[in-house]
């Protein structure tokens, strides 16, 4: 039978001779050279050679366990003379013994990692991993221990896991953002003689909101013309924040100051500036300087950092209002004046006043905008603003005159303003009442006395305060012996009544009645109107049947016998 055990061979042999592996030996071998040993399998004849007489095996080359840890070969022993095996062919193993010839190698040459600034001590940053090709099952050749070569006191590494953690309290990104940490991985459990490898870990502190906004100056001054409309930007202020991104966002607000109601501050989200704007109309003549207290604050802070103090700062903003040459200002937004329609030319109606609001108080001159008074009915004293008539008025033609008066600074004609003037023409009784329409009526031949044949209405262009009160009567020249009477109804109407029984159209076909209409105002106005009454044949119901044709073309005027 074969007489050997498993062969062990140290890797990386550096001797000048071949490395002895071991001896194949059969108990049939009497040492007389009658047996021949043959080797086959992994590396036989190349890596491994055998002395066919003695069975001694040698390795011809340096072996690397990490390349191949085990070789499987077959051994034969044959009788030289007969060529027959004296032992059955048998498999055997050459196991390569590990030596510590490999250093730990990190999975990355360079690691990058981030950790928030101000993190608690022991905050996880990143885990590094090194692997060692040596045999982990034998000795400590592959037992890796991590240590920090560079990066203390800021960071530490767990020796067994390679977990890097923060090691220093209150690491501040604003002081230092980048750290280069060098980690060593050493085998042999870190003992002397162990092999080592290193890696670089580039650690960046990420920003947290640990800094408040700060104004670079305590006072700002801006100027703005008093004419600036609401919404006008008048200046920009900017607080700076050592943080970045979201943590450097700033909101601005006005917290105090006499200009609290007069100005606004808007946050420009692009530039993180505060834009001071006009909120209400300014007036240099009322107030020339405003002060504001403006606050810049971070809108968001992680509550755990609130202990670092108020995340806001304030500055004083002084705003100087600049005088602007303003147009004159009238004492009223509009003027309403009244004048009687019978006013003589050059009658003063009233006056307007305008003043230059500026400190200079420039004198003003007045004029009428002729586009609004084409007929030049009114005029104005350019010096004192008195309005007077330059033509006669008629209320019945135009009740209201709407004109525009212009006030212009004498020293600066570009500065002018306008005001509407509403002039009401007051009524004077200068129109007589008259018939509301042309009256032409008829009377039946068989009419009875005191029969109403027509109701009369009157109109008057005037507009008396207490209303119209008309009176009606027959003209004096027609009153005596008239065939008709006028009955005044005392309600601004009158009736024409028959005065006799029966009329004869052959005797008198047409009557012309002159009627006097008077008003009750001062001075009394009256007019005479003529009513034409034709005599007609009627049926028994009083319906007209026929009248003389000439009555239709009879000239108006006074007729005898009416």
């Amino acid at each position: 039978s074969w007489m050997w055990n498993q062969f062990f061979l140290l890797e990386e042999y550096t001797g000048s001779d071949y490395q002895y592996v071991g001896k194949l030996h059969s108990d049939q071998d009497r040492g007389d050279g009658s047996l021949k040993y043959i080797l086959s399998g992994d590396g036989a004849g190349d890596l491994f050679i055998i002395n066919e007489n003695t069975g001694d095996i040698q390795a011809t080359k340096r072996l690397d366990r990490e390349e191949k840890p085990v070789y499987i070969l077959r051994a034969q022993a044959i009788n030289r003379r007969t060529g027959r095996p004296v032992e059955p062919e048998s498999e055997f193993i050459i196991k390569i013994h590990d030596i510590n010839d490999n250093e730990p190698i990190f999975t990355k040459e360079v690691y990058t990692a981030t950790v928030p600034e101000m993190s608690d001590v022991g905050t996880f940053v990143v885990q590094v991993t090194a692997t060692d090709a040596d045999d982990p099952t034998y000795g400590n050749s592959a037992k890796v221990v991590y240590s920090i070569l560079q990066g203390q006191p800021y960071f530490s590494v767990e020796s067994e896991t390679g977990i890097i953690k923060t090691a220093l309290l209150n690491m501040d990104r604003e002081n230092r953002e980048q750290y280069q940490v060098v980690i060593q991985a050493k085998d042999m459990g870190g003992q002397m003689g162990g092999l080592s490898g290193t890696t670089t870990v580039n650690i960046t502190l990420t920003d947290v909101n640990d800094n408040p906004p700060r104004f670079p100056q305590s006072t700002y001054q801006f100027k703005t013309p008093e004419s600036s409309p609401p919404g006008t930007p008048i200046g920009r202020i900017k607080a700076s924040d050592a943080d970045v991104g979201e943590n450097a966002e700033i909101e601005y607000s006005i917290t105090d100051g006499e200009g609290l109601d007069m100005f606004d501050v808007i946050t420009d989200q692009e530039t993180q500036e505060g834009i001071i704007t006009v909120k209400k109309l300014l007036d240099f003549e009322k107030k020339k300087v405003y002060t504001l207290k403006v606050e810049a604050s971070n809108p968001y802070v992680e509550p755990r950092f609130l202990y670092l103090g108020p995340f806001k700062d304030s500055a004083t903003v002084r705003i100087v209002v600049e005088d602007v040459d303003e147009p004159p200002v009238f004492s009223k937004l509009a003027y309403i004046l009244q004048i009687r329609e019978d006013a003589q030319i050059n009658t003063t109606i009233g006056s307007v006043t305008a003043q230059d609001p500026d400190a200079a108080r420039n004198p003003v001159k007045y004029s009428v905008d002729r586009h609004t008074d084409m007929d030049r009915i009114f005029n104005i004293d350019s010096g004192n603003g008195s309005i007077f008539t330059s033509k006669l008025l008629d209320r019945e033609t135009l009740l209201w005159h709407n004109i525009t008066v212009i006030a212009t600074e004498i020293n600066n004609p570009k500065q002018s303003s306008r005001v509407p003037l509403y002039i009401k023409v007051l009524d004077v009784n200068d129109n007589a009442p008259e018939f509301a329409e042309f009256y032409e009526t008829f009377v039946c031949e068989k009419a009875k006395a005191d029969q109403l044949i027509q109701t009369l209405h009157a109109v008057d262009k005037d507009d008396p305060y207490s209303g119209h009160q008309f009176s009606f009567s027959l003209a004096p020249e027609a009153a005596s012996g008239s065939n008709f009477t006028i009955q005044d109804n005392k309600d601004n109407t009158a009736g024409i009544l028959t005065r006799k029984n029966g009329y004869n159209r052959h005797e008198m076909s047409t009557y012309l009645l002159p009627v006097v209409i008077s008003d009750n105002d001062y001075p009394v106005q009256s007019s005479t109107g003529t009513v034409t009454v034709r005599v007609c044949a009627c049926d028994h119901h009083g319906n007209m049947q026929s009248c003389h044709a000439e009555a239709l073309i009879h000239p108006t005027g006074l007729s005898t016998g009416a």
Epitope: E246, Q272, S297, Y300, E302, P303, L306
Partner: antibody, heavy 121, light 107 residues
């Protein structure tokens, strides 16, 4: 009252990018903070990140390397992109508004109804 | 990260009863805690912020208490519409973290 509505594909292939939109009505996204939160099967919730009223972003460190939140103020929308997704990203995704409750703190006070996303091949 | 632990995870109660839900945190978060409610088919609703301040529109039967690491949501005299999922969230530090929730069901 503000309303939020998520939209996007319900199925995403592994290793691809997940993209969701959030449309906001009756409120401008140029005020307050606008974020994304997800709920995994089993009810575990995770804050993913937000975009501020002026466009700055803040992300959960666990997602920092593959998340992006952007916005389109003209459309009053904001967006989530999550790259290199795996089955572990299967969740219901919610867009939300955070308002300032004083003391520098922002609290989620309005949520969208949620969009269910499955990562599967 | 701040760990949030809810208890119980499931709770059954009848209308009219009072219930309390607990939320514990792994570190002191002062009072920077909110409570949310979710009812099936509805969006999440903010109930309480700053540990105990009721959000506008939250009925007065809800109350929040606690500070530091131990917080409680109490609902007095349950109404039928109160059943659903409740969970807490801290906003003391980033990343903001949530509890896994308590499911409140009708007994």
């Amino acid at each position: 009252e503000v309303q939020l509505q998520e939209s996007g594909p319900g199925l995403v292939r592994p290793s691809q990018s997940l993209s969701l939109s959030c449309s906001v009505t009756d409120y401008s996204i140029t005020s307050n903070y606008w974020g994304w939160i997800r709920r995994f099967p089993g009810n575990k919730m995770e804050w993913m990140g937000y975009i501020t009223y002026s466009g700055y972003t803040s992300y959960n460190p666990s997602l920092q390397s593959r998340i992006s939140i952007t916005r389109d103020t003209s459309k009053n929308q904001f967006f989530l992109q999550l790259n290199s997704v795996t089955a572990e990203d299967t969740a219901t995704y919610y867009c939300a508004r955070s308002i300032n409750h004083g003391g520098y703190s922002y609290v989620v006070d309005a949520w969208g109804p949620g969009a269910s996303v499955t990562v599967s091949s | 990260d701040v760990q949030m632990t809810h208890s119980p995870s499931y709770l059954a109660a009848s209308p009219g009863e009072s219930v309390s839900i607990s939320c514990k945190t792994s570190k002191n978060i002062s009072n920077y805690l909110v409570w949310y409610q979710q009812k099936p088919g509805e969006a999440y609703k903010l109930l309480i912020y700053s540990g105990s301040t009721l959000q506008s529109g939250t009925p007065s039967r809800f109350s929040g208490s606690g500070s530091g690491t131990d917080f409680t949501l109490t609902i007095r005299s349950l109404e039928p519409e109160d059943f659903g999922l409740y969970f807490c969230q801290q906003y003391y530090e980033k990343p903001f973290t949530f509890g896994s929730g308590t499911k409140l069901e009708i007994k």
